[in-house]
Protein backbone atom coordinates (compact mmCIF):
# COMPACT_ATOMS: atom_id res chain seq x y z
CA UNK A 1 0.00 0.00 0.00
CA UNK A 2 1.06 3.57 -0.58
CA UNK A 3 0.84 4.53 3.06
CA UNK A 4 0.95 8.06 4.38
CA UNK A 5 4.53 8.87 3.36
CA UNK A 6 3.73 8.74 -0.33
CA UNK A 7 0.74 10.99 0.02
CA UNK A 8 2.58 13.57 2.12
CA UNK A 9 4.53 14.51 -0.99
CA UNK A 10 1.42 16.38 -2.08
CA UNK A 11 1.51 20.14 -1.96
CA UNK A 12 -0.86 22.80 -3.13
CA UNK A 13 1.54 23.52 -5.99
CA UNK A 14 1.19 19.99 -7.26
CA UNK A 15 -2.57 20.33 -7.13
CA UNK A 16 -3.42 23.55 -8.85
CA UNK A 17 -6.12 21.38 -10.44
CA UNK A 18 -7.81 23.24 -13.22
CA UNK A 19 -10.37 21.27 -15.14
CA UNK A 20 -11.22 23.47 -18.08
CA UNK A 21 -10.21 26.46 -16.00
CA UNK A 22 -12.07 25.40 -12.86
CA UNK A 23 -10.13 25.00 -9.61
CA UNK A 24 -11.29 22.80 -6.75
CA UNK A 25 -13.20 24.60 -4.03
CA UNK A 26 -11.41 22.50 -1.43
CA UNK A 27 -9.02 19.56 -1.17
CA UNK A 28 -8.05 17.29 1.68
CA UNK A 29 -6.61 13.90 2.47
CA UNK A 30 -8.86 11.18 3.82
CA UNK A 31 -8.94 7.43 4.11
CA UNK A 32 -11.75 5.65 2.32
CA UNK A 33 -13.61 2.72 3.81
CA UNK A 34 -16.76 0.80 3.04
CA UNK A 35 -20.03 0.96 4.94
CA UNK A 36 -18.87 -2.21 6.72
CA UNK A 37 -15.55 -0.60 7.69
CA UNK A 38 -13.30 -2.40 5.26
CA UNK A 39 -10.44 -0.23 4.00
CA UNK A 40 -9.80 0.73 0.40
CA UNK A 41 -6.11 0.14 -0.27
CA UNK A 42 -3.86 0.68 -3.25
CA UNK A 43 -0.90 -1.50 -4.25
CA UNK A 44 1.71 -1.36 -7.00
CA UNK A 45 1.79 -4.69 -8.81
CA UNK A 46 3.63 -5.35 -12.08
CA UNK A 47 4.02 -1.64 -12.76
CA UNK A 48 0.32 -0.98 -12.43
CA UNK A 49 -1.77 -0.08 -9.43
CA UNK A 50 -4.41 -2.39 -7.98
CA UNK A 51 -7.28 -1.36 -5.74
CA UNK A 52 -8.34 -3.65 -2.90
CA UNK A 53 -11.13 -3.74 -0.36
CA UNK A 54 -9.80 -5.44 2.75
CA UNK A 55 -9.75 -5.66 6.52
CA UNK A 56 -6.64 -4.06 7.94
CA UNK A 57 -4.64 -5.50 10.79
CA UNK A 58 -5.04 -3.68 14.09
CA UNK A 59 -2.20 -1.14 13.83
CA UNK A 60 -1.90 -1.04 10.06
CA UNK A 61 -1.97 2.49 8.62
CA UNK A 62 -4.86 3.34 6.32
CA UNK A 63 -4.05 4.53 2.81
CA UNK A 64 -5.06 8.12 2.18
CA UNK A 65 -6.58 9.66 -0.90
CA UNK A 66 -6.47 13.27 -1.99
CA UNK A 67 -10.07 14.34 -2.57
CA UNK A 68 -10.51 17.42 -4.73
CA UNK A 69 -13.98 18.93 -4.71
CA UNK A 70 -15.38 20.88 -7.64
CA UNK A 71 -18.60 22.83 -7.97
CA UNK A 72 -20.60 22.21 -11.09
CA UNK A 73 -23.89 23.50 -12.40
CA UNK A 74 -26.78 21.07 -12.25
CA UNK A 75 -28.86 22.20 -15.23
CA UNK A 76 -32.60 22.45 -14.62
CA UNK A 77 -33.29 20.52 -17.81
CA UNK A 78 -31.45 17.55 -16.26
CA UNK A 79 -32.78 17.90 -12.73
CA UNK A 80 -36.38 18.73 -13.58
CA UNK A 81 -36.16 21.68 -11.19
CA UNK A 82 -37.37 25.15 -12.01
CA UNK A 83 -33.91 26.65 -11.67
CA UNK A 84 -30.33 25.54 -12.18
CA UNK A 85 -28.70 24.16 -9.05
CA UNK A 86 -25.19 23.26 -8.00
CA UNK A 87 -23.66 19.87 -7.47
CA UNK A 88 -20.41 18.77 -5.94
CA UNK A 89 -18.02 16.63 -7.93
CA UNK A 90 -14.91 14.93 -6.64
CA UNK A 91 -11.72 13.42 -7.99
CA UNK A 92 -9.77 10.85 -5.97
CA UNK A 93 -6.00 10.57 -6.16
CA UNK A 94 -4.14 8.09 -3.94
CA UNK A 95 -0.72 9.02 -5.24
CA UNK A 96 0.81 11.73 -7.39
CA UNK A 97 -0.44 11.80 -11.00
CA UNK A 98 -2.81 8.85 -10.52
CA UNK A 99 -6.58 9.19 -10.31
CA UNK A 100 -9.48 6.81 -9.92
CA UNK A 101 -11.21 6.36 -13.27
CA UNK A 102 -14.54 4.89 -14.24
CA UNK A 103 -14.18 2.33 -16.99
CA UNK A 104 -17.79 2.12 -18.08
CA UNK A 105 -17.16 -0.52 -20.74
CA UNK A 106 -15.63 -2.96 -18.25
CA UNK A 107 -17.80 -1.78 -15.30
CA UNK A 108 -14.54 -1.36 -13.40
CA UNK A 109 -12.77 1.25 -11.30
CA UNK A 110 -9.14 1.73 -12.25
CA UNK A 111 -6.16 3.88 -11.36
CA UNK A 112 -4.87 5.78 -14.35
CA UNK A 113 -1.89 8.06 -14.69
CA UNK A 114 -2.96 11.23 -16.43
CA UNK A 115 -2.29 14.93 -16.81
CA UNK A 116 -4.49 17.95 -16.34
CA UNK A 117 -7.09 18.64 -17.46
CA UNK A 118 -8.45 15.38 -16.13
CA UNK A 119 -10.87 13.40 -18.30
CA UNK A 120 -14.54 13.22 -17.37
CA UNK A 121 -14.04 9.60 -16.31
CA UNK A 122 -12.08 10.85 -13.28
CA UNK A 123 -15.00 12.92 -11.95
CA UNK A 124 -17.73 11.62 -9.67
CA UNK A 125 -20.85 13.39 -8.41
CA UNK A 126 -20.79 13.29 -4.63
CA UNK A 127 -23.93 12.22 -2.78
CA UNK A 128 -24.50 11.88 0.94
CA UNK A 129 -27.66 9.86 0.94
CA UNK A 130 -27.22 8.05 4.23
CA UNK A 131 -26.11 9.59 7.56
CA UNK A 132 -22.34 10.02 7.43
CA UNK A 133 -21.70 8.04 4.27
CA UNK A 134 -21.06 9.22 0.73
CA UNK A 135 -21.59 7.76 -2.71
CA UNK A 136 -19.71 8.45 -5.93
CA UNK A 137 -21.73 8.63 -9.14
CA UNK A 138 -19.95 8.55 -12.50
CA UNK A 139 -20.06 11.89 -14.26
CA UNK A 140 -19.90 10.04 -17.56
CA UNK A 141 -22.65 7.56 -16.75
CA UNK A 142 -25.45 8.88 -14.52
CA UNK A 143 -27.00 6.19 -12.35
CA UNK A 144 -23.74 4.26 -12.17
CA UNK A 145 -21.83 4.37 -8.87
CA UNK A 146 -18.54 3.17 -7.45
CA UNK A 147 -19.38 0.12 -5.39
CA UNK A 148 -17.90 -2.97 -3.79
CA UNK A 149 -18.05 -6.31 -5.56
CA UNK A 150 -16.00 -9.38 -4.64
CA UNK A 151 -13.51 -7.41 -2.53
CA UNK A 152 -12.81 -4.99 -5.38
CA UNK A 153 -14.23 -1.68 -6.47
CA UNK A 154 -16.58 -1.92 -9.42
CA UNK A 155 -19.17 0.20 -11.19
CA UNK A 156 -22.68 -0.62 -10.08
CA UNK A 157 -25.89 0.49 -11.77
CA UNK A 158 -28.46 1.93 -9.38
CA UNK A 159 -32.02 1.90 -10.69
CA UNK A 160 -33.82 4.31 -8.38
CA UNK A 161 -33.13 6.90 -5.72
CA UNK A 162 -34.41 4.47 -3.07
CA UNK A 163 -31.48 2.17 -3.88
CA UNK A 164 -28.97 4.93 -3.21
CA UNK A 165 -28.83 3.71 0.37
CA UNK A 166 -27.66 0.25 -0.73
CA UNK A 167 -24.71 -0.61 1.48
CA UNK A 168 -22.35 -1.66 -1.32
CA UNK A 169 -22.23 1.87 -2.79
CA UNK A 170 -21.83 3.64 0.56
CA UNK A 171 -18.39 4.79 1.72
CA UNK A 172 -16.99 6.55 4.75
CA UNK A 173 -14.36 9.27 4.66
CA UNK A 174 -12.04 9.74 7.61
CA UNK A 175 -9.21 12.20 8.09
CA UNK A 176 -7.75 10.23 10.98
Amino acid sequence: AFGISGVQKYTRALHDSSITGISPITEYLASLSTYNDQSITFALEDESYEIYVEDLKKDEKKDKVLLSYYESQHPSNESGDGVDGKMLMVTLSPTKDFWLHANNKEHSVELHKCEKPLPDQAFFVLHNMHSNCVSFECKTDPGVFIGVKDNHLALIKVDSSENLCTENILFKLSET
Epitope: I25, T26, Y28, A30, Y69, H74, S79, G80, D81, G82, V83, G85, K86, M87, L88, V125, L126, H127, N128, M129, H130, S131, N132, V134, S161, E162, L164, C165, E175, T176
Partner: antibody, heavy 121, light 107 residues
Framework: QVQLQESGPGLVKPSETLSLTCTVS????????VHWIRLPPGKGLEWIGV???????DYNSALMSRVTISKDNSKSQVSLKLSSVTAADTAVYYC???????????????WGQGTLVTVSS | DIQMTQSPSSLSASVGDRVTITCLAS??????LAWYQQKPGKSPKLLIY???RLADGVPSRFSGSGSGTDFTLTISSLQPEDFATYYC?????????FGQGTKVEIK
Protein backbone atom coordinates in the same frame (compact mmCIF):
# COMPACT_ATOMS: atom_id res chain seq x y z
CA GLN B 1 -37.69 30.36 -8.07
CA VAL B 2 -36.95 28.22 -5.03
CA GLN B 3 -39.47 28.68 -2.22
CA LEU B 4 -40.24 26.94 1.07
CA GLN B 5 -43.29 27.58 3.26
CA GLU B 6 -43.90 26.19 6.73
CA SER B 7 -47.45 25.63 7.97
CA GLY B 8 -49.15 24.12 10.99
CA PRO B 9 -50.83 25.02 14.26
CA GLY B 10 -49.30 27.88 16.20
CA LEU B 11 -50.38 26.47 19.54
CA VAL B 12 -49.80 22.92 20.84
CA LYS B 13 -50.67 21.54 24.28
CA PRO B 14 -47.99 19.97 26.46
CA SER B 15 -47.55 16.19 25.94
CA GLU B 16 -49.17 16.41 22.49
CA THR B 17 -47.49 16.07 19.09
CA LEU B 18 -46.32 19.08 17.13
CA SER B 19 -46.96 18.61 13.39
CA LEU B 20 -45.61 20.98 10.74
CA THR B 21 -45.51 20.83 6.96
CA CYS B 22 -42.97 22.42 4.63
CA THR B 23 -44.33 22.91 1.11
CA VAL B 24 -41.65 23.57 -1.50
CA SER B 25 -41.61 24.84 -5.06
CA UNK B 26 -38.97 25.50 -7.71
CA UNK B 27 -37.16 22.22 -7.09
CA UNK B 28 -37.79 18.51 -6.62
CA UNK B 29 -37.47 16.76 -3.28
CA UNK B 30 -35.90 13.84 -5.15
CA UNK B 31 -32.90 16.09 -5.86
CA UNK B 32 -32.26 18.02 -2.64
CA UNK B 33 -32.30 17.44 1.10
CA VAL B 34 -34.53 19.51 3.37
CA HIS B 35 -33.66 20.39 6.98
CA TRP B 36 -35.73 21.48 9.95
CA ILE B 37 -34.15 24.04 12.27
CA ARG B 38 -35.67 25.90 15.20
CA LEU B 39 -34.98 29.11 17.13
CA PRO B 40 -36.26 29.06 20.72
CA PRO B 41 -36.94 32.52 22.20
CA GLY B 42 -33.74 34.13 23.50
CA LYS B 43 -31.59 31.20 22.33
CA GLY B 44 -29.61 30.16 19.26
CA LEU B 45 -30.39 28.07 16.19
CA GLU B 46 -30.88 24.36 16.82
CA TRP B 47 -30.70 21.78 14.05
CA ILE B 48 -33.58 19.30 14.31
CA GLY B 49 -32.95 16.97 11.38
CA VAL B 50 -32.76 16.40 7.66
CA UNK B 51 -34.53 14.25 5.11
CA UNK B 52 -32.25 13.50 2.20
CA UNK B 53 -33.03 13.30 -1.51
CA UNK B 54 -33.04 9.49 -1.33
CA UNK B 55 -35.46 9.49 1.60
CA UNK B 56 -33.25 8.65 4.59
CA UNK B 57 -33.37 10.88 7.67
CA ASP B 58 -30.94 12.01 10.35
CA TYR B 59 -31.86 13.70 13.61
CA ASN B 60 -30.53 15.78 16.47
CA SER B 61 -29.33 13.31 19.12
CA ALA B 62 -31.22 15.07 21.90
CA LEU B 63 -34.52 14.94 19.99
CA MET B 64 -34.13 11.58 18.24
CA SER B 65 -36.59 9.67 20.42
CA ARG B 66 -39.34 12.23 19.74
CA VAL B 67 -38.82 13.42 16.16
CA THR B 68 -39.84 12.07 12.75
CA ILE B 69 -39.24 13.75 9.40
CA SER B 70 -40.93 12.36 6.31
CA LYS B 71 -41.79 13.57 2.84
CA ASP B 72 -44.14 13.14 -0.08
CA ASN B 73 -42.14 13.82 -3.24
CA SER B 74 -45.21 14.02 -5.44
CA LYS B 75 -46.85 16.64 -3.22
CA SER B 76 -43.55 18.51 -2.71
CA GLN B 77 -44.10 18.38 1.04
CA VAL B 78 -41.87 17.59 3.99
CA SER B 79 -43.39 16.98 7.39
CA LEU B 80 -42.02 17.30 10.90
CA LYS B 81 -43.55 15.51 13.87
CA LEU B 82 -42.30 16.12 17.41
CA SER B 83 -44.02 14.12 20.13
CA SER B 84 -44.47 14.70 23.86
CA VAL B 85 -43.80 18.41 23.59
CA THR B 86 -43.08 20.67 26.54
CA ALA B 87 -42.68 24.43 26.93
CA ALA B 88 -39.00 23.99 25.97
CA ASP B 89 -40.16 23.14 22.43
CA THR B 90 -41.64 26.62 21.97
CA ALA B 91 -39.72 28.13 19.05
CA VAL B 92 -39.83 29.50 15.54
CA TYR B 93 -39.53 26.45 13.26
CA TYR B 94 -37.83 26.76 9.85
CA CYS B 95 -37.39 24.42 6.93
CA UNK B 96 -34.39 24.94 4.65
CA UNK B 97 -33.04 23.39 1.45
CA UNK B 98 -29.55 22.10 0.77
CA UNK B 99 -27.22 24.14 -1.40
CA UNK B 100 -25.94 21.15 -3.33
CA UNK B 101 -27.79 18.53 -5.32
CA UNK B 102 -28.00 15.36 -3.22
CA UNK B 103 -25.63 16.41 -0.45
CA UNK B 104 -25.55 18.68 2.56
CA UNK B 105 -21.94 19.88 2.57
CA UNK B 106 -22.78 23.35 1.28
CA UNK B 107 -25.24 24.48 3.95
CA UNK B 108 -28.67 25.94 3.23
CA UNK B 109 -29.15 29.03 1.06
CA UNK B 110 -32.95 28.72 0.89
CA TRP B 111 -35.15 29.04 3.98
CA GLY B 112 -38.82 29.32 4.71
CA GLN B 113 -40.04 32.38 6.60
CA GLY B 114 -40.50 30.34 9.77
CA THR B 115 -43.56 29.59 11.87
CA LEU B 116 -43.90 30.24 15.59
CA VAL B 117 -45.11 27.28 17.63
CA THR B 118 -46.04 27.89 21.24
CA VAL B 119 -46.44 24.97 23.64
CA SER B 120 -48.94 25.93 26.31
CA SER B 121 -52.08 24.57 27.93
CA ASP C 1 -21.66 14.78 18.36
CA ILE C 2 -19.40 17.56 17.12
CA GLN C 3 -19.50 20.65 19.34
CA MET C 4 -19.14 24.08 17.76
CA THR C 5 -17.86 26.84 20.02
CA GLN C 6 -18.24 30.39 18.81
CA SER C 7 -16.46 33.41 20.25
CA PRO C 8 -17.15 36.00 21.31
CA SER C 9 -20.80 35.48 22.26
CA SER C 10 -21.37 39.19 21.66
CA LEU C 11 -19.38 42.21 20.56
CA SER C 12 -19.89 45.94 20.16
CA ALA C 13 -18.45 47.62 17.09
CA SER C 14 -18.76 50.77 15.03
CA VAL C 15 -19.53 51.23 11.36
CA GLY C 16 -16.31 50.80 9.40
CA ASP C 17 -14.71 48.48 11.96
CA ARG C 18 -13.11 45.18 11.01
CA VAL C 19 -14.91 42.39 12.85
CA THR C 20 -13.69 38.83 13.38
CA ILE C 21 -15.75 35.94 14.74
CA THR C 22 -14.22 32.55 15.40
CA CYS C 23 -15.68 29.06 15.48
CA LEU C 24 -13.92 26.07 16.97
CA ALA C 25 -14.99 22.50 16.17
CA SER C 26 -14.47 19.73 18.75
CA UNK C 27 -13.05 17.51 15.99
CA UNK C 28 -11.95 17.99 12.40
CA UNK C 29 -14.68 18.97 9.96
CA UNK C 30 -12.40 19.48 6.93
CA UNK C 31 -13.83 22.61 5.30
CA UNK C 32 -17.51 21.74 5.67
CA LEU C 33 -18.53 24.82 7.60
CA ALA C 34 -21.21 27.41 6.84
CA TRP C 35 -21.77 30.89 8.31
CA TYR C 36 -25.22 32.45 8.60
CA GLN C 37 -26.51 35.91 9.46
CA GLN C 38 -29.83 36.31 11.24
CA LYS C 39 -31.72 39.48 12.06
CA PRO C 40 -34.64 39.63 14.54
CA GLY C 41 -37.85 38.25 13.03
CA LYS C 42 -36.08 37.13 9.84
CA SER C 43 -34.89 33.80 8.50
CA PRO C 44 -31.16 33.04 8.59
CA LYS C 45 -29.18 33.99 5.50
CA LEU C 46 -26.29 31.89 4.20
CA LEU C 47 -23.14 34.01 3.97
CA ILE C 48 -20.28 31.53 3.54
CA TYR C 49 -20.21 27.83 2.70
CA UNK C 50 -17.37 25.31 2.45
CA UNK C 51 -15.51 27.57 4.94
CA UNK C 52 -14.39 30.11 2.35
CA ARG C 53 -16.96 30.32 -0.45
CA LEU C 54 -19.10 33.45 -0.64
CA ALA C 55 -22.78 32.62 -1.14
CA ASP C 56 -24.66 34.23 -4.02
CA GLY C 57 -25.52 37.88 -3.48
CA VAL C 58 -23.37 38.29 -0.35
CA PRO C 59 -21.16 41.43 -0.28
CA SER C 60 -17.41 40.87 -0.65
CA ARG C 61 -16.71 42.49 2.74
CA PHE C 62 -17.65 39.11 4.21
CA SER C 63 -14.99 36.41 4.05
CA GLY C 64 -14.35 33.05 5.64
CA SER C 65 -11.17 31.17 6.39
CA GLY C 66 -9.96 28.05 8.14
CA SER C 67 -10.01 24.28 7.88
CA GLY C 68 -9.89 21.34 10.23
CA THR C 69 -11.09 22.70 13.57
CA ASP C 70 -10.49 26.47 13.50
CA PHE C 71 -12.60 28.85 11.42
CA THR C 72 -13.04 32.59 11.12
CA LEU C 73 -15.68 34.90 9.69
CA THR C 74 -14.38 38.39 8.92
CA ILE C 75 -16.34 41.51 8.05
CA SER C 76 -13.73 43.86 6.60
CA SER C 77 -15.69 47.07 7.09
CA LEU C 78 -18.84 46.82 9.17
CA GLN C 79 -21.93 48.40 7.62
CA PRO C 80 -25.16 49.45 9.37
CA GLU C 81 -27.04 46.49 7.89
CA ASP C 82 -24.48 44.03 9.33
CA PHE C 83 -25.68 44.38 12.93
CA ALA C 84 -27.16 40.93 13.52
CA THR C 85 -26.46 37.53 15.06
CA TYR C 86 -24.00 35.24 13.26
CA TYR C 87 -23.92 31.46 13.48
CA CYS C 88 -21.49 28.82 12.26
CA UNK C 89 -22.70 25.33 11.35
CA UNK C 90 -20.70 22.18 10.70
CA UNK C 91 -21.90 19.92 7.87
CA UNK C 92 -19.19 17.28 8.10
CA UNK C 93 -21.11 14.77 10.21
CA UNK C 94 -24.66 14.40 11.41
CA UNK C 95 -26.07 15.69 13.62
CA UNK C 96 -25.21 18.98 11.91
CA UNK C 97 -24.56 21.35 14.79
CA PHE C 98 -24.61 25.13 15.11
CA GLY C 99 -22.43 27.36 17.21
CA GLN C 100 -24.24 29.27 19.95
CA GLY C 101 -24.19 32.51 17.97
CA THR C 102 -22.38 35.86 18.08
CA LYS C 103 -24.45 39.01 18.45
CA VAL C 104 -22.88 42.03 16.75
CA GLU C 105 -24.21 45.22 18.32
CA ILE C 106 -23.70 48.92 17.68
CA LYS C 107 -21.13 50.55 19.94
Amino acid sequence: QVQLQESGPGLVKPSETLSLTCTVSGFSLTNYGVHWIRLPPGKGLEWIGVIRAGGSSDYNSALMSRVTISKDNSKSQVSLKLSSVTAADTAVYYCARDHYFSNSYGGSPYWGQGTLVTVSS
Amino acid sequence: DIQMTQSPSSLSASVGDRVTITCLASQTIATWLAWYQQKPGKSPKLLIYAATRLADGVPSRFSGSGSGTDFTLTISSLQPEDFATYYCQQLYNTPYTFGQGTKVEIK
